[in-house]
């Protein structure tokens, strides 16, 4: 007969390690007992447990509550044990010694490695603003044993660079994602993906990009100049811009205060029934935390079209 085992066993920190030891023998052979020990530098070998075919499992005091048999059904030739709640101090070599009848004794050694899975963290970079050059969007750090893999998953065009720092039996990996900010990136997800053999699946942390920008301002409402005549009701000028954060709007008149009855409502300037006093240069001011923009238009209110003598055919925008 022979022992079926594994010379390398890997377990995740905090989980149960199965230390395999199965005797593959002839049908008439029996396993009397299996002795488990840890190969210890000071004491040679330190007993963990004794599995007896008749008397069952006896665990040494040092490993009380930490060693058990795998759940049933159990094969009488299977001397495997579970080491519960593995910690890094459990790393090392273990030995199973199988006493069989009539074939005698067999022994096998295996190495236990304990994986420490990472707990990744994502840190956004400084505020992103359109017009900046290559800028740090986010960094992602993960430390584990062995070294984790840190990558980025995104539709956004950018460059990733990583650095790692090794400690004994573990490594901290930091990956940075740099990009040239543009408004099209607003609201786009940037996902840090961390892989490690101690994780059942990749860990993903998503950061939503926010790029500050302010578009050029323009004014709508003067497209048909002939509509701007004395007596017209419901005339409005609308200031067009967009930004992140959303901009605030303000209206002024270049050559004096806004005429009475002219109302500012957000991005829109509303006029009462038009008179020639409403002619003038109007300025739309747009601003957010990033920047400010302005656009001005010249309004000329035409005389009553029913009075040809007073008609002025001039409306201009600049």
């Amino acid at each position: 007969g022979e022992l079926e085992t594994s010379d390398l066993v890997t377990v995740v920190l905090g989980q149960d390690a199965k230390l395999p030891c199965f005797y593959r023998g002839d049908p008439d052979e029996q396993v009397g007992q299996v002795a488990w020990a840890r190969v210890d530098p000071n004491e040679g070998t330190r007993e963990l447990a004794l599995l007896h075919s008749k008397y069952g499992l006896h665990v040494s005091p040092a490993y009380e509550d930490r060693v058990e048999q795998p759940p049933p059904p159990r094969d009488p030739l299977d001397g495997s044990i579970l080491l519960r709640n593995a910690v890094q101090a459990d790393e090392g070599e273990y030995e199973c010694r199988v006493s069989t009848f009539p074939a005698g004794s067999f022994q096998a050694r295996m190495r236990l490695r304990v994986l420490v899975p990472p707990l990744p963290s994502l840190n956004p970079g400084p505020p992103l603003e359109e017009g900046q050059g290559l800028t740090l969007a986010a960094s992602c750090t993960a430390e584990g044993s062995p070294a984790p893999s840190v990558t980025w998953d995104t539709e956004v065009k950018g460059t990733q660079s990583s650095r790692s720092f090794k400690h004994s039996r573990s490594a901290a990996v930091t990956s940075e994602f740099h990009l040239v900010p543009s408004r099209s990136m607003n609201g786009q997800p940037l996902t840090c993906v961390v892989s490690h053999p101690g994780l059942l699946q990749d860990q993903r942390i998503t950061h939503t990009l926010q790029v500050a920008f302010l578009a050029e301002a323009s004014v709508r409402g003067l497209e048909d100049q002939n509509l701007w005549h004395v007596g017209r009701e419901g005339a409005t000028l609308k200031c067009l811009s967009e930004g992140q954060p959303p901009p605030k709007y303000n209206w002024t008149r270049l050559d004096g205060p806004l005429p009475s009855g002219v109302r500012v409502k957000g991005d829109t300037l509303g006029f009462p029934p038009l008179t020639t006093e409403h002619s003038g240069v109007y300025v739309c001011h747009v601003s957010n935390e990033l920047s400010s923009r302005a656009s001005q238009v010249t309004v000329e209110v035409l005389a009553d079209p029913e009075d040809p003598g007073k008609q002025v055919d001039l409306v201009s925008a600049s």
Epitope: L8, V39, P41, E93, P146, A147, P148, S149, S195
Partner: antibody, heavy 116, light 108 residues
Amino acid sequence: QVQLVQSGAQVKKPGASVKVSCKASGYTFTGYYIHWVRQAPGQGLEWMGWINPNSGGTNYAQKFQGRVTMTRDTSISTAYMELSRLRSDDTAVYFCAREDWDFDYWGQGTLVTVSS
Amino acid sequence: EIVLTQSPGTLSLSPGERATLSCRTSQSVSSSYLAWYQQKPGQAPRLLIYGASNRATDIPDRFSGSGSGTDFTLTINRLEPEDFAVYYCQQYGSSPITFGQGTRLEIK
């Protein structure tokens, strides 16, 4: 700084044994496994096995079972690899390497020539 | 055992060019368990990349590693004269530890 310094080149006759040493410095010797890797002339790297300097536990590649013995002396931070019943195809450079999952530091290598 | 197959066997390039070396594994290997080494004539191997993509201490950033599962790549941007050597990949996730057969990077 971390260093692994190996013993000098040796010439052996077929059937003899060779023992190569690997002295570690610059770190805690018992804190890292030591592996042995060999490289025949013009060939690639071949893993032979490891020793845990802390426990003295070993694991050998199947190919070398029964012919290789790895030992250590913690008092002088030195690991040893002994290969017996030498054949001409054991002519190679033998390296020791420190394991930190990967092999982050290597000895300079020891050329063992097996020739009658 | 896990078999690592490197390609090409030999790569002839000029300084300043980019080298792309491949390592395929016969079974899936966690990226945390894959390393790349550089070896120059008469010298010991030197760790370049560990965990598939992490540069070892003092390795220039023109060296980068990537890949997962069974396909891994070592890329060397802007080749320098000192980069011409033999490169090995290695898996250390299961026993026995295994190496690829190597890729020789030579000057064209």
